[in-house]
């Protein structure tokens, strides 16, 4: 689709005569009829296949034609066409005299023709005007012409339709040849594909508008090049999405089990020594004078039972003081004024004289201690039970009552959930913090590998010599159906060639 444009510039008819030679009265009021048609080697009358146009009266005798309009007409004249421009044409321009105001052909006398020119040739689509001048015996016509494409049509013959757009169906303007020129930020055949943020990962990122980088599931970061670790992963990283590879010192499915609590948290106070003792667990060894899980509390000086021989300890602002029982004296009631004659040993203790009877020593029965056997042995004072176990005095010995999940003399052993072999069919058991997990062998599934999943025993093609293989689903074994001439569990022996047995 395009327009053939004809710009009339000057018409010369100095004598003011018609084609017949007869003069116009009072002068030749001139208008033009234009016929555009397909190329003809000899331009002949007939239908104006490409279109016609007429002008109003443009002047009398000789005149120059102004650009744009004159008397309501248009200059250049427009001859639109709705087909591919063929590149060739024929053009007939007739100058007519209008005695009156009616310019219709049927209203004019046949001899009102002033002049007629006919040209034909090649014409490429373009913006440049071709200037031409045609002269007859009495008249001269100067004009120029060109073919341009209609809006949204492009190419050498105005056959390429291209309409700029900026919507869901495309984001482009049109080049002179009708090819699309994408707007900034868009690409693709129809400029529908946004150009993502520079560096946006090709596989893990995408965009719906230019300079955007939206991440696909499992990826994050400005350029979608960082994987998202497993939900709940605390001290771990990933190289592919949903992984949780633990940092050093951390363990467990979510890397939330502290294997190096001492380093990560420094829980022990007052110069105590910290020892890691399992997942999220530690032990503080207190310096003398401190107590508590983290050695965070000072011991009162009386807590170390400094008073001997049944002396009672009293805390004071500046230390402690021992109140000694009768027969004893000294800072810690360590000196005796008694002898064995005073029967100083309690609870069945036996007395032994020392230093020629100036002193004595008590030998205590089991369960009693102290210089006078006055103290019942509390075998739980050292708090020997680990993992929150309760220490119980049982006569001459002690025992630990363990919390659920622990065992051993001192509750030092974690009861393994795997100890009772819960995984069926040879499954491998793994102890987890909150239970266990079974890794099942091929052919089994379920939390405890209790579900048999059938194996295709024929998958490994065990039968030879084109034998047909059948799977026995009840035993997960195979059976080979041998072709004629072969025997054996796998049809591996030809008939007549018995296998060589070693006996």
């Amino acid at each position: 689709s395009g327009v053939f444009q004809l710009q009339l510039q000057e018409f010369i008819n100095e004598r003011g005569v018609l084609a017949s030679g007869r003069p116009c009265e009072p002068g030749c009021r001139t208008f033009f009829r234009v016929c555009l048609k397909h190329f003809q080697a000899v331009v002949s009358p007939g239908p104006c296949t490409f279109g016609t146009v007429s002008t109003p009266v443009l002047g009398t005798n000789s005149f120059a034609v102004r650009d744009d309009s004159s008397g309501g007409g248009r200059n250049p004249l427009q001859l639109p066409f709705n087909f591919t421009w063929p590149g060739t044409f024929s053009l007939i321009i007739e100058a007519w005299h209008a005695p009156g105001d009616d310019l219709r052909p049927e209203a004019l006398p046949p001899d009102a023709l002033i002049s007629k020119i006919a040209i034909q040739g090649s014409l490429a689509v373009g913006q440049n005007w071709l200037l031409d001048e045609q002269t007859s015996t009495l008249t001269r016509l100067r004009y120029s012409y060109r073919v341009i494409c209609s809006d949204n049509y492009y190419g050498d013959n105005c056959s390429r339709l291209c309409k700029k757009r900026n919507d869901h169906f495309g984001h482009y303007v049109c080049q002179p040849d009708g090819n699309l020129s994408c707007l900034p930020g868009w690409t693709g055949e129809y400029c529908q594909q946004p150009i993502c943020l520079s560096g946006c990962h090709e596989q893990n990122g995408y965009c719906s508008k230019p300079a955007e980088c939206l991440c696909r599931p499992g990826w994050q970061g400005r350029l979608c090049n960082e994987c998202i670790p497993h939900n709940g992963c605390r001290h771990g990283t990933c190289s592919t999405p949903w992984q949780c590879t633990c940092d050093e010192g951390w363990g467990g499915l979510f890397c939330d089990q502290d294997l190096n609590y001492c380093t990560h948290h420094s829980p022990c106070k007052n110069g105590a020594t910290c020892s890691n003792s399992g997942q999220r667990s530690y032990t503080c060894t207190c310096r003398p004078g401190y107590t508590g899980v983290d050695c965070e509390l000072e011991l009162s000086e009386c807590d170390s039972n400094p008073c001997r021989n049944g002396g009672s300890c009293k805390d004071q602002e500046d230390g402690y003081h021992c109140l000694c029982p009768p027969g004893y004296y000294g800072l810690h009631c360590e000196h005796s004024t008694l002898s064995c004659a005073d029967s100083p040993c309690f609870n069945g203790g036996s007395c032994r004289e020392r230093n020629q009877g100036a002193n004595y020593a008590c030998e205590c029965p089991p369960n009693f201690t102290g210089s006078n056997c006055e103290k019942k042995v509390d075998r739980c004072t050292s708090n020997p039970c680990a993992n929150g176990g309760q220490c119980l005095n049982r006569g001459p010995s002690r025992m630990c009552r363990c919390r659920p999940g622990f065992t051993g003399t001192y509750c030092e052993l974690h009861v393994s959930d795997c100890a009772r072999n819960p995984c069926a069919h040879g499954g491998t058991c793994h102890d987890l913090e909150n239970g266990l997990m079974c890794t099942c062998p091929a052919g089994f599934s379920g939390r405890r590998c209790e579900v048999r999943t059938s194996i295709d025993a024929c998958a490994s093609s065990p039968c030879f010599n084109r034998a047909t293989c059948y799977t026995d689903l009840s035993t997960d074994t195979f059976v080979c159906n041998c072709p004629y001439g072969f025997v054996g569990s796998r049809c591996e022996f030809p008939v007549g060639l018995p296998p060589s047995f070693p006996w």
């Epitope: 502290d258 609590y261 948290h265 829980p267 999220r280 667990s281 530690y282 032990t283 107590t291 508590g292 899980v293 983290d294 965070e296 509390l297 000072e298 011991l299 009162s300 000086e301 807590d303 805390d315 004071q316 602002e317 500046d318 230390g319 402690y320 993992n387 929150g388 919390r403």
Partner: antibody, heavy 119, light 108 residues
Framework: QITLKESGPGLVKPSQTLSLTCAVS??????????WSWIRQHPGKGLEWIGY???????YYNPSLKSRVIILVDTSKTQFSLKLSSVNAADTAVYYC???????????WGQGTMVTVSS | ETTLTQSPGTLSLFPGERATLSCRAS???????LAWYQQKPGQAPRLLIY???SRATGIPDRFSGSGSVTDSTLTISSLEPEDFAVYYC?????????FGQGTKLEIK
């Protein structure tokens, strides 16, 4: 916002074991830096510290009650519990659970639960 | 154990007056490990001061604490009606952790 709430029977018979639970809601329970304590208050009297437990399960008890006390932690349910054995009338009190961060200044307390020891 | 003795046992004052509550330890305790609590009838204690002089979150600045290794003081600069309650001191320097017997602050 962390809250603590004690629960358990309000009446226990002498010589039996008193059992209370403290439910912790909020996000600090799994932190290793807190001491989770039990404290009691005899009617019309002052406060007595019973003992504490850490998230790791390690405990420390008041020496005067040590032989009768067990404190346990259940991290999966974010709660800790008190068991006091061989109770007598002197164990009648309001029992509080409390949190202490780093040191033993108790910044968050439960509302308390009254336990009466009586036959 | 470390015994904390609070004085006076009861303190009667008018709103607007200054209150000074004392706490004495039977043996030296680090002043960094002393706390004060307020308790109203039927309620749990509320932490006011820790580390001898640091105010807990949300505690008005009329409450202040000071002290040495055996003597600590809680001061309420100008009493408000809601300040009348029982106040306890606590030491957490030595084992076992202990509390004072309390000072009852009542409206005169």
């Amino acid at each position: 916002q962390i809250t603590l709430k004690e629960s358990g029977p309000g009446l226990v018979k002498p010589s039996q074991t008193l059992s209370l639970t403290c439910a912790v809601s909020g996000d600090s329970f799994s932190s290793g830096n807190y001491y989770w304590s039990w404290i009691r208050q005899h009617p019309g009297k002052g406060l007595e510290w019973i003992g504490y437990i850490k998230y790791t399960g390690s405990t420390y008890y008041n020496p005067s009650l040590k032989s009768r006390v067990i404190i346990l932690v259940d991290t999966s349910k974010t709660q800790f519990s008190l068991k006091l054995s061989s109770v007598n009338a002197a164990d009648t009190a309001v029992y509080y659970c409390a949190r202490a961060p780093g040191t033993h200044a108790f910044d968050v307390w439960g509302q308390g639960t009254m336990v009466t020891v009586s036959s | 154990e470390t015994t904390l003795t609070q004085s006076p046992g009861t303190l009667s004052l008018f709103p607007g007056e200054r209150a000074t509550l004392s706490c004495r330890a039977s043996q030296s305790v680090s002043s960094s490990y002393l706390a004060w609590y307020q308790q109203k009838p039927g309620q749990a204690p509320r932490l006011l001061i820790y580390g001898a002089s640091s105010r807990a979150t949300g505690i008005p600045d009329r409450f202040s604490g000071s002290g040495s290794v055996t003597d600590s003081t809680l001061t309420i600069s100008s009493l408000e009606p809601e300040d009348f309650a029982v106040y306890y001191c606590q030491q957490y320097s030595r084992s076992p952790i202990t509390f004072g017997q309390g000072t009852k602050l009542e409206i005169k």
